[in-house]
Structure formats: C-alpha cells, structure tokens
Interface confidence: medium
C-alpha cells in the first residue's frame, strides 16, 4: 500500500477541510502551550506544501514521512525552549525517536486557564464574523487540553458544535437554545476524552495484546451473531486505528477509521442487525454511531461453553497449537453469552482460564486438573455484583452529591498523599457512576458501572503518573489493567500517613463563593472535606457530617447577609474553631 507521497495520499483521501482540521489537532496536542495564531500559521504552511505534493508527488520533500514533515514543522517554533523546556531536546533527535519524544511530553494536566464561556451574543457575533476561525479555535482549545482526544471523533464534535451555533444564533431565545447544547457537548466531550485516554493507556502501558483482548470482549458483546473470524478482523483493524491515533498519526487514523466504518457497513449482514440506521448516516456520524451501537441480540441456543473449553480431550492440544487464538475464542464465546458482564470481568475470567491451562497442561492429568476451572469464576463474578449492589443502595439513599462525598472520604483515607484537586475530580467522577448506572436493570448495571470506573480510575492513574506521590496508587495502576478497580477497592485506610498540619487559610472563605454556580460551590465544599480528612484521617463519618453540615449552614447564612465579606470573616473564624474542637484538631 506504498504511495510515492504519503502527505498527498492523505490529503486526497481526507479532503482539504478534514486534512487541515486533523493537522491542527495533531499540532495542538503536541505543543499545548502555543498560541492559536502560531498553530494556524503552521497548519497553513503544511497544507500549502501538501497541495504541491498532490500536484506533483515527485516534488521535493514530498516523499518524506508524515512524522518527518510534521516534526520538522513543529521544530521551527522559535520559543520552543522557553515555553517547553526539555521538550526542545526532542528536535535534536531523528525519527522515529523524535516523535516518541514528543509523545512522552504530552501533558494530561496542562497548566492552561479554565475555558470561560462568553455571553451568548458575543459567541454568536464571533461565529458570524468568522465561522472558520471560530471552529478552528474550538478544535485547538479542546485538543490542547485533551492531548489524547480521539481526533476523528473531535471532528464529529466540531460538526455538532457548528450545527448548534448555526441553529441557535438565529433563534428567538439564543441562550435557551444554545446553552443546553453546549453543556451536552462539554459533558460528552469530557467522557469521550476519558474513554480514549484509557484506550491509549492500555496500548502504551500494557501493549497491543491487552488492547486486543479488551476489543475482542467488547465487540463480541456488541456483535454476538458475528462469528469469531469476523470479530478477529474487526479487532485487528480497530487496534490499528487506535494505535495510530494514540501515536499521534492522526491522518492515518482518521483514514483507517473511515475504511473500517465502510467495511462494517458493507458487511453488516454478517456483523449485526443493529447497524442499519448508523450506516445510512454521513461519515462522521456513521463512525460515531457504530462506536456507540447497542448490543445485538444473542443467537438462540448457543451450546454450553464447557464442552469445547473444559470437557473436550483436545483442550491442551488446541491451546498449545495457538494460545492467543484459543484464548481469543474463549473470550469471544464467553463475552457473546454475557452482555451482562463488564469487559474487565470477562478479561479477568479469561486470565484465570489462561493461568489454569498454563498450570494444568503441564500436569500429569491435565483434564482432572482443569475440570473445575469454571468454579473459579464464581467469586470473580460475585465480587463486582455485590460491590455494585451495595454502592447503588448507598447512592439511592444519599443522592449524587452526598454519595460523592462518601467516596471522597473513602478515597482520601485510602490514598491521602494524592493532591486535593485530583482527589476531588476523581471522586466526583466516581460518584457519577450512581446516576449513570444505578438506574439500569441488573443485566446492564455491571457493564455500565465497572467499565465506567475503569475509565475514571485511569484518570487517577495518568494524573498520578505525572507527579507520583503514593506507592499504593502506583501499584494499583501498574500491576494489572483489569484489576485496577478491585485493587483500589481493596485498599484500606493508609495507616502510614502522617496527618497534614492544620492551616486555617485552607478553611477561609470569601463572599465570591456566593456568586459561584451550584457545581462550583460543591467543588469548594468538597475541597474542604478532603482537606479535613487529610488533617484528621481517623475522623468518623458522623464527625465529618456534622462539620460539613455546619459548613453548608455557614455558607448559606453569609450569602444571605447584607455584609457578606464581614460575615465570612467573623463566622468563618467561629466555624474553624468549632470544627477544630469537634474533630479534636
């Protein structure tokens, strides 16, 4: 599939609009601090160069790899050393080491200002004045804050973003039309970014085999009527797509994703009965729809798994012949029968099966040794079932905010060394599992909850990796991808932790809290809660609840006062003193 000019090939395949958008995303994900105008200039230069290669593939430099072309362009940025420090050293390297170096410097938590949403009229004016710049700015701002965002999917978000402004800037009540759409895009975007971050972590930290196993399980649940060979083909192609995107090869990734969507739609009869509507949509919507499509119905009368994977006398011979294919088939057969299991549970079962075969196929009587392997699955299945049952009961009893607070306390006690903003962010997201998943019937709860928790815990892992402070977090994050959640669940209070010194400033609040949104006010209170636990890790639930109730009453009282600032100063001192007494600080 060799082309004289790779850049010309991708430009022709993707078209100018998508080519420019993807190059902008790629550059913004690499150089996250660069101003918008600088990136636009670089993108325009690359685009003009690509056009010369389309006109003549033999033209000078057109035969260079995309990494070489893009890397050379990034390395022309004048302020590279001042802005990025040691990342500038990447430019002294040759490909492929230079690209690897850029990848290693991607920052999951870049020091960028929070995106503040302007007034609706201001946004609509900007949209009408220069639609192209407005949309590019959206791509740039998302890409630099989410350096692993799935690039072809970001094009889909940008298309929806444009549609929202096109529709709502003409509406009678612009704000009522636009704001809910922007909120939805923001929330979906954060979720999409976190899901993709887990895919990239899976590939980069645990390797292609781990990603392929995840994909076999998920696609087998989604397409239970497809046969194993079909699932294998999809897994191979999907792995290529995500490897490319996670590796910064965004043009190849988008191109291959389009090819995969085309293949799936051309072969939907042998894949799934649920794809018809997706396949009638335009490309970006089609790919998104396929990625989110509901599970197909399970074929009727699937035979027992035991016959082929336990009772057969050929189990060890088949396993020895092609271990990964045999395990892949086991995973496929198990997953297509269990849409009610989380992917990570299915992977734990497959790992247990593999470990058993490794041990038993070397034993004197292999069959006798592995005959009871399915019995070992029972506790593995019951553990997440029980955990979800308990936590959904707690969520229904407390509601989302207080459920988040319970998790904040739980996780701060487990890993108190982790920074307060990270604990707040991760615990808030963990707490969202309640409203996201507990409403589902039993059969859908586990795949919803445990696979969502894997995504959230990966956020903790990637943030912690940047500045490691806890051996326990490192251990849970690195030992096993599929056992991360059970590892964190099993952590008890960290008895080695030395409580943080009390600092009154941490608990000093001002009148500005009154003008915050409900969400931001919650974050302030939850930040204080984490700090309390760090000061007093042995505080009981009751003690913490009493202090938090007092705190809520204090904020409410002072926000109603005529002289808010004086109220916060005077009542705040009293609250701190009372809290110290209540907690024995």
């Amino acid at each position: 599939d060799a082309h004289k000019s790779e850049v010309a090939h991708r430009f022709k395949d993707l078209g100018e609009e998508n080519f420019k958008a993807l190059v902008l995303i790629a550059f913004a994900q690499y150089l996250q601090q660069c101003p918008f105008e600088d990136h636009v200039k670089l993108v325009n230069e690359v685009t003009e160069f690509a056009k010369t290669c389309v006109a003549d593939e033999s033209a000078e430099n057109c035969d260079k790899s995309l990494h070489t072309l893009f890397g050379d362009k990034l390395c022309t940025v004048a302020t590279l050393r001042e802005t990025y420090g040691e990342m500038a050293d990447c430019c002294a390297k040759q490909e492929p080491e230079r690209n690897e170096c850029f990848l290693q410097h991607k920052d999951d938590n870049p020091n960028l200002p929070r995106l503040v949403r302007p007034e609706v009229d201001v946004m609509c004016t900007a949209f009408h004045d220069n639609e192209e710049t407005f949309l590019k700015k959206y791509l740039y701002e998302i890409a630099r804050r989410h350096p692993y965002f799935y690039a072809p999917e970001l094009l889909f978000f940008a298309k929806r973003y444009k549609a929202a402004f096109t529709e709502c800037c003409q509406a009678a009540d612009k704000a009522a039309c636009l704001l809910p759409k922007l909120d939805e895009l923001r929330d979906e975007g954060k979720a999409s970014s976190a899901k993709q971050r887990l895919k990239c972590a899976s590939l980069q930290k645990f390797g292609e085999r781990a990603f392929k196993a995840w994909a076999v399980a998920r696609l087998s649940q989604r397409f239970p009527k497809a046969e194993f060979a079909e699932v294998s083909k999809l897994v191979t192609d999907l792995t290529k797509v995500h490897t490319e995107c996670c590796h910064g090869d965004l043009l190849e990734c988008a191109d291959d994703r389009a090819d995969l969507a085309k293949y799936i739609c051309e072969n939907q009869d042998s894949i799934s009965s649920k794809l018809k509507e997706c396949c009638e949509k335009p490309l970006l919507e089609k790919s998104h729809c396929i990625a989110e499509v509901e599970n197909d119905e399970m074929p009727a009368d699937l035979p027992s798994l035991a016959a082929d994977f336990v009772e057969s006398k050929d189990v060890c011979k088949n396993y020895a012949e092609a271990k990964d294919v045999f395990l892949g088939m086991f995973l496929y057969e198990y997953a297509r029968r269990h849409p009610d299991y989380s992917v990570v549970l299915l992977l734990r079962l497959a790992k247990t099966y593999e470990t058993t075969l490794e041990k038993c196929c070397a034993a004197a009587d292999p069959h006798e040794c592995y005959a009871k392997v399915f019995d070992e699955f029972k506790p593995l299945v019951e553990e997440p079932q029980n955990l979800i049952k308990q936590n959904c009961e707690l969520f229904e009893q407390l509601g989302e905010y207080k459920f988040q607070n319970a998790l904040l306390v739980r996780y701060t006690k487990k890993v108190p060394q982790v920074s307060t903003p990270t604990l707040v962010e991760v615990s808030r997201n963990l707490g969202k599992v309640g409203s996201k998943c507990c409403k589902h019937p039993e059969a859908k709860r586990m795949p919803c909850a445990e696979d969502y928790l894997s995504v959230v815990l990966n956020q903790l892992c990637v943030l912690h990796e940047k500045t490691p402070v806890s051996d326990r977090v490192t251990k849970c994050c690195t030992e096993s991808l599929v056992n991360r959640r059970p590892c964190f669940s099993a952590l008890e209070v960290d008895e080695t932790y030395v409580p943080k010194e009390f600092n009154a400033e941490t608990f000093t609040f001002h009148a500005d809290i009154c003008t915050l949104s409900e969400k931001e006010r919650q974050i302030k209170k939850q930040t204080a809660l984490v700090e309390l636990v760090k000061h007093k890790p042995k505080a009981t639930k009751e003690q913490l609840k009493a202090v938090m109730d007092d705190f809520a009453a204090f904020v409410e009282k002072c926000c109603k006062a005529d002289d808010k600032e004086t109220c916060f100063a005077e009542e705040g001192k009293k609250l701190v003193a009372a809290s110290q007494a209540a907690l024995g600080l």
Partner: nanobody, 125 residues
Framework: EVQLVESGGGLVQAGGSLRLSCTAS????????MGWFRQAPGKEREFVAA?????????DYADSVKGRFTISRDNAKNTVYLQMNGLKPEDTAVYVC?????????????????WGQGTQVTVSS
C-alpha cells in the same frame, strides 16, 4: 467473507490417488473446523470428512471412505487437504470444501457457513 478455493481434482483410474487442497482467505483460519462434502449428479450432497479447529487432532469420516481417505490441515498455509487413495468409480463427484466456526468439528452441512465452488473428481473403471 471467507473465500475457499479448491484444487487438485481431475480424472483418475480406479485404484488411483488424488490429493485435494482447499485454501482459505481468512487470517483466523485456525479457528475454523473444516469439512469436505461431495455431490454426484442427481444425488444429495453428502458428508465425506471433517477436521477439528486448531491442532486438527480430531477427525471424522463417512463410513464409505474410512481407511481410504485422510483429512489434514496446515494452519500456516490456511489450507486443508483430502488425501484420497484406493479411489472407486462411486467416488466420482464434485468435491466441495466448507468452513465452520460454529463448533470445534462437525459432520453436518447446516453447521458450515462457508463453501467453496468445488473441484471435479472423476474415477474411471
């Protein structure tokens, strides 16, 4: 789709031998049970031989060919073979290769998803 292409058929004298080959287009060939069926003019399609997935340790034959025909597979080449010795005029038929991922091995035609075009075997007396 899995494409199956048979080869090796031809005209042979009674008592002679032929080796049929069937090559599959799929990477996951190893996960398929493979079978040979045959259809003589004016007759129903009948089962000849089958071999299990993966190592191909389990084989099965129609009573009429037992001891004369041998089925084998080479996973590296995505190919299944049917070695036919002691051929008889009643073995004359179109021999068709089939692939199934429904079961580890099967002698039932309804459990096979994919079929080749077939190769003609003629045994003269």
């Amino acid at each position: 789709e899995v494409q199956l292409v048979e080869s090796g058929g031809g005209l042979v004298q009674a008592g002679g031998s032929l080796r049929l080959s069937c090559t599959a287009s799929r990477r996951a060939f190893i996960g398929y049970a493979m079978g040979w069926f045959r259809q003589a003019p004016g007759k129903e399609r009948e089962f000849v031989a089958a071999i299990s997935w993966f190592a191909g340790d389990t084989t099965d034959y129609a009573d009429s060919v037992k001891g004369r025909f041998t089925i084998s597979r080479d996973n590296a080449k995505n190919t299944v073979y049917l070695q036919m010795n002691g051929l008889k005029p009643e073995d004359t038929a179109v021999y068709v290769c089939a692939a199934s991922s429904a079961r580890p091995m099967s002698g039932r035609s309804d459990e096979y998803h994919y079929w080749g075009q077939g190769t003609q075997v003629t045994v003269s007396s």
